[in-house]
Amino acid sequence: AWELTILHTNDVHSRLEQTSEDSSKCVNASRCMGGVARLFTKVQQIRRAEPNVLLLDAGDQYQGTIWFTVYKGAEVAHFMNALRYDAMALGNHEFDNGVEGLIEPLLKEAKFPILSANIKAKGPLASQISGLYLPYKVLPVGDEVVGIVGYTSKETPFLSNPGTNLVFEDEITALQPEVDKLKTLNVNKIIALGHSGFEMDKLIAQKVRGVDVVVGGHSNTFLYTGNPPSKEVPAGKYPFIVTSDDGRKVPVVQAYAFGKYLGYLKIEFDERGNVISSHGNPILLNSSIPEDPSIKADINKWRIKLDNYSTQELGKTIVYLDGSSQSCRFRECNMGNLICDAMINNNLRHTDEMFWNHVSMCILNGGGIRSPIDERNNGTITWENLAAVLPFGGTFDLVQLKGSTLKKAFEHSVHRYGQSTGEFLQVGGIHVVYDLSRKPGDRVVKLDVLCTKCRVPSYDPLKMDEVYKVILPNFLANGGDGFQMIKDELLRHDSGDQDINVVSTYISKMKVIYPAVEGRIKFSTGSH
């Protein structure tokens, strides 16, 4: 028998520095977690103790903090090279800055293979990107070889900016011939490494003949066997065992997100490459693990540029950006409109001639808007200003909801109106009218939404049984501020871009902004 140790990360999202327990900015260092310096310490410790070790990443290193905003992926290549990753799968966020923003900083600089079997380049891009990412890679590990085959969410064109010259195929259809080829090339230990979410990971384990292990990402799934060491609640045991259609037991793993854990899986293979046993658990990278001094010094060196960036002008406002709780928790506020407009703008994807865009709606809890921006400072808007407005380090995500769920959300928005509570919704692509004289749960008297399947966008009444795409903060997608109905009833959830980054990009693009209060949210006469 031959034993392999798989160390894995996924959805690190630009958390190069240690973070607080909730993966936001580290405040009290003695209680902080993760970061590449701490990760390196643990990885090196395991590499020294065990003979056959692979360090893998299942995608979405890009996007999530000011590190990515400033360094645009160069930081990912640099520190992943320093940690000596063995392979990485492409995630949807790796395309956030377009194909060029993937090729130049990452694909050309990475000293490890970057993989995806279901992304096919066409047209002029085919020759430009040839060999920079691969469908699979065979890695020597000790005296054996292991095949790693990559995959990426086929929803990427709706979630990021891969352009028109990359085709995202069905994962299972694309993986099977690559695995067949590896088997015929005498590779009898095969890991599927990819970024399509836990449900697809399980399907790959079930359907793709010849895959021995699945290492996934995208859904930020936390798996654990025993008592979990932090706040994350396990979605199942680690590893999660799937019985394949041909009767094999296939371990499936994922390691939550944000570099908080290092996935640790031990696999035992027989001489024909069959999995005999698998066990392990994610390792919580808490402060009991010291940060590696040389990596930490390098982080500090790279940090200097970030501090300078924070105070640079992104653009100008010629109006007061009202982000006060007195406005945003009670009525339509122009800061809410600005943020929602930025959220929609960030999700413009012309993927179908029938649709002007795939999504037109935004909702945003007023309590998430934490500060106004005064235009009397020469109109200057900096990253620092935006960090005061959006201090929680969240993301603006894409969900699919039924109209009936949206109606419940808007009823919840005003169910206890007047108490300055955070659940009051700011909107984009939505016209809502409330009648506060009616009882809670029955206060939405009009709810019109902007069409997507139209050449001239217009507002139509919400249909209860129709499925709508909506951009919203991850906080709401996870049921925050009492929006349990969103968490319970959402049909799909894809994590999006860092909130501040979305707004800063929009402001930089627009150069001068002047958001107004324009009647998106109204109260019917006599009730307000």
Partner: antibody, heavy 120, light 107 residues
Framework: QVQLVESGGGVVQPGRSLRLSCAAS????????MHWVRQAPGKGLEWVAV????????YYADSVKGRFTISRDNSKNTLYLQMNSLRAEDTAVYYC?????????????WGQGTMVTVSS | DIQLTQSPSSVSASVGDRVTITCRAS??????LAWYQQKPGKAPKLLIY???SLQSGVPSRFSGSGSGTDFTLTISSLQPEDFATYYC?????????FGGGTKVEIK
């Protein structure tokens, strides 16, 4: 001892068909991927095709794709190469070879070869 | 397809000479290269696999080195039975390809 013996070669006219066989003995045939490699007179070696151990996966050189079919019968310990639409440039000694069980494939056991001549 | 270019195409040497044959791949193939010896009228014989590992039963005067795109087969002290044609071969991907061959002749 471990052995591969090819048969079925001969002289054939262009456009016609021929079926080569390779009988294996001395090892567990069904555990190994099997290959055909050819060598035109006075020329170098050219890989032709492979079939996986259980026979489900097959790959071919571009020069024979669509014309040649590799197959195997594990119950008879025999490898086959069905050659259709033969051309003059298919004239060669055809070897069957065992791809060993490790990566990368190397050919550790070869047959003695069978000569195929395509001529009008 | 991965092309393998062997050089020289032929070499004249004497018994006891050190002979070096090179094989260059058109793209990175790690260390996944094999070397074969073929004598006239015979099937090829495997000498080296994975660039530098000696196949069992092959004399230690044969050695292989290299990785990535550049590889070398060295015969440290040529023996009479070593006069033959030598081929490199990659199986990093399908189609499997061979080099054009290097004929080692008696000077």
């Amino acid at each position: 001892q471990v052995q591969l013996v090819e048969s079925g070669g001969g002289v054939v006219q262009p456009g016609r068909s021929l079926r080569l066989s390779c009988a294996a003995s001395g090892f567990t045939f069904s555990h190994y991927g099997m290959h055909w490699v050819r060598q035109a007179p006075g020329k170098g070696l050219e890989w032709v095709a492979v079939i996986s151990d259980e026979g489900s996966n097959k790959y071919y050189a571009d020069s024979v794709k669509g014309r040649f079919t590799i197959s195997r019968d594990n119950s008879k310990n025999t490898l086959y190469l069905q050659m259709n639409s033969l051309r003059a440039e298919d004239t060669a000694v055809y070897y069957c070879a065992r791809g060993w069980l490790r990566y990368p494939i190397a050919f550790d056991i070869w047959g003695q070869g069978t000569m195929v001549t395509v001529s009008s | 397809d991965i092309q393998l270019t062997q050089s020289p195409s032929s070499v004249s040497a004497s018994v006891g000479d050190r002979v070096t044959i090179t094989c260059r791949a058109s793209q990175d193939i790690s260390s996944w290269l094999a070397w074969y010896q073929q004598k006239p009228g015979k099937a090829p014989k495997l000498l080296i696999y994975a660039a530098s590992s000696l196949q069992s039963g092959v004399p230690s005067r044969f050695s292989g080195s290299g990785s990535g795109t550049d590889f070398t087969l060295t015969i440290s002290s040529l023996q009479p039975e070593d006069f033959a044609t030598y081929y490199c071969q990659q199986a990093n991907d399908f189609p499997i390809t061979f080099g054009g061959g290097t004929k080692v002749e008696i000077k």
